[in-house]
């Protein structure tokens, strides 16, 4: 029979825990229950994170950065649970934590590697810069550096500009794409490999609509089934571009099923909304209604942008009066 080997120079039991910035996590550690339990959690084998012995916490020499942020599962210690509850993790908390548990008859050392990720919901924006049109995928705070990919009509695009700003603890990233004169559909994907979280932005341009003054226009906005899940909270915003900036006409929040309308001539069909169809009507068109109309359906996992260009032309009567 071969002995079961434990090399002194081989790392101990090691687990990886992935946390999200500002959220609480648990660093796991278990032992065979016994009397006279001593528990020490240390960071990078030197900073004291949490100490427990003689039936209570002893935090006199705890490193100040962990003050009021750590606790044990006190009712479960006698059952062999030495896990650490860790509040509001930051990127500075990343690293190796060692849990030393001693009892009167056994000593155990467990290592936990903590990795922290950040993924504040990205956005896809449509911007006009002079005569150029841009789609911008951006994420305000992300860590580690994400993978950003663009597709045009479902075909990957190799050119991929990234404007990156690094702060103390995360990256802020903009990825602009010049889409001037294009009526293709575009898709941008931002992936955080650590948190295994992916966000997708999709932009679709609809054919231009020509309408006469005083008529009404119906603009479609139906989410693509690939991304859309009606069970997930989302927001729908209709806006109109005037002089390079968008003004909000109306929005709908799925969580409260509230619709807020800022333009009296705008109407939404409640029945269609219940069927996840966010098409809208704009009544009594006038010449100043010409422009680009943007439907934005957004959740934590996607942004779907649909753009319509509306041309309002003078009616025959108006033309003859002039």
């Amino acid at each position: 029979i071969f002995p079961l080997a434990f090399f002194i120079y081989v790392p101990m039991n090691e687990q990886i825990v992935i946390g999200r910035l500002d959220e609480d996590i648990i660093l796991p550690s278990s032992f065979e229950r016994g009397s006279e339990v001593v528990i020490h959690w240390k960071y990078q084998d030197s900073y004291k994170v949490h100490s427990y012995y003689k039936g209570s916490d002893h935090l006199e020499s705890q490193d100040p950065r962990y003050a009021n942020r750590t606790s044990l599962f006190y009712n479960e210690i006698q059952n062999g649970n030495a896990s650490l509850f860790f509040r509001r993790v930051s990127l500075l908390d990343e690293g190796i934590y060692t849990c030393y548990v001693g009892t009167a008859i056994q000593v155990i050392t467990n290592k936990v590697v903590l990795k922290v990720g950040v993924f504040l919901t990205p956005v896809m924006k449509y911007e006009k810069r002079n005569t150029n049109s841009f789609l911008i995928c951006s994420v305000l705070s992300v860590y580690p550096r994400p993978i950003i990919t663009w597709k045009m009509d479902n075909t990957p695009i190799s050119e991929n500009n990234m404007e990156e700003t690094g702060s103390l603890d995360s990256f802020s990233i903009n990825s602009p794409l010049n889409i001037t004169g294009s009526n293709s559909s575009y898709e941008c994907t931002i992936e955080n490999s650590l948190l295994k979280q992916t966000w997708t932005g999709r932009w679709t341009m609809k054919d231009g609509l020509h309408k006469m003054q005083s008529e009404h226009v119906s603009l479609s906005c139906q989410p693509v089934n690939d991304y859309f899940s009606p069970n997930q909270d989302f927001k729908v915003t209709w806006s109109r571009m005037k002089s390079g900036t968008f003004s909000v006409l109306a929005y709908y929040l799925s969580s409260s099923q509230n619709t807020i309308i800022n333009e009296s001539r705008f109407s939404w069909n409640k029945e269609l909304i219940n069927q996840s169809d966010f098409s809208m009507n704009l009544m009594d068109l006038n010449l100043s209604d010409s422009g680009e109309y943007l439907c934005n359906i957004s959740s934590d996992e996607y942004t779907l942008l649909t753009i319509h260009t509306v041309h309002v032309e003078p009616s025959q009567e108006t033309a003859s009066h002039n």
Epitope: M12, E60, I105, Q106, T109
Partner: antibody, heavy 116, light 107 residues
């Protein structure tokens, strides 16, 4: 009665390796951590490390990294320590000792002499 | 690593004396201190853990005390069989460390 019976004295040449055994009886082998302690001639005690027979992660002293390898054979309730790349500095008495963070029971010690 | 200092390598005493052996830790070890007795040619023997808890079978003339960084092993009335080397050990954290030892001798 708890007993920890260690293997006999060893005389080895520099650069060689040696494996010391510690056979236990009188208690449940898997419940206790088995520690190893070095006592150089006329000197104090130095803790080398421990091993948990039931696979839990075991603590060790970084000073002995690459020098000592601890193993157990649960079927015979025996713990082993192998020391490699031996030099005269490794000449000492080596004890096995069972317990948690203090050591309740000790073996009688194994004297290791490293000499050419 | 935590350093355990036993400042007296030797202590000259007489039978029946009250003897105090001291040990100082380089940092607060929260009473996680054990004391061992080692007689010539023998293995160490556990006397006390947690600074003052006597191990099974240890005579009550041996008592431990202390807190923070300063610890003491007291033998209330020295007997002939107590002549030995005494080591302190911190069991607060790994790596466990021992003092250099204090040897009791007769004057």
């Amino acid at each position: 009665e708890v007993q920890l019976q260690q293997s006999g004295p060893e005389l080895v040449k520099p650069g060689a390796s040696v494996k010391i055994s510690c056979k236990t009886s009188g208690y449940t082998f898997t419940e206790y951590t088995m520690h190893w302690v070095k006592q150089s001639h006329g000197k104090s005690l130095e803790w080398i490390g421990g091993i948990n027979p039931n696979n839990y992660g075991a603590p060790y002293n970084q000073k002995f990294k690459g020098k000592a390898t601890l193993t157990v054979d649960k079927s015979s309730n025996t713990a082993y320590m192998e020391l490699r790349s031996l030099t005269s500095e490794d000449s000492a008495i080596y004890y096995c000792a069972s317990g948690g963070y203090y050591f309740d029971y000790w073996g009688q010690g194994t004297t290791l002499t490293v000499s050419s | 690593d935590i350093v355990m200092t036993q400042s007296h390598k030797f202590m000259s005493t007489s039978f029946g004396d009250r003897v105090s052996i001291t040990c100082k830790a380089s940092q607060d070890v929260g009473t996680a201190v054990a004391w061992y007795q080692q007689k010539l040619g023998q293995s160490p023997k556990l006397l006390i853990s947690w600074a003052f808890t006597r191990h099974t079978g240890v005579p009550d003339r041996f008592t431990g005390s202390g807190s923070g960084t300063d610890y003491t092993l007291t033998i209330s009335s020295l007997q002939a069989e107590d002549l030995a080397l005494y080591y302190c050990q911190q069991h607060y954290d790994t790596p466990f460390t021992f003092g250099s030892g204090t040897k009791l001798e007769i004057k």
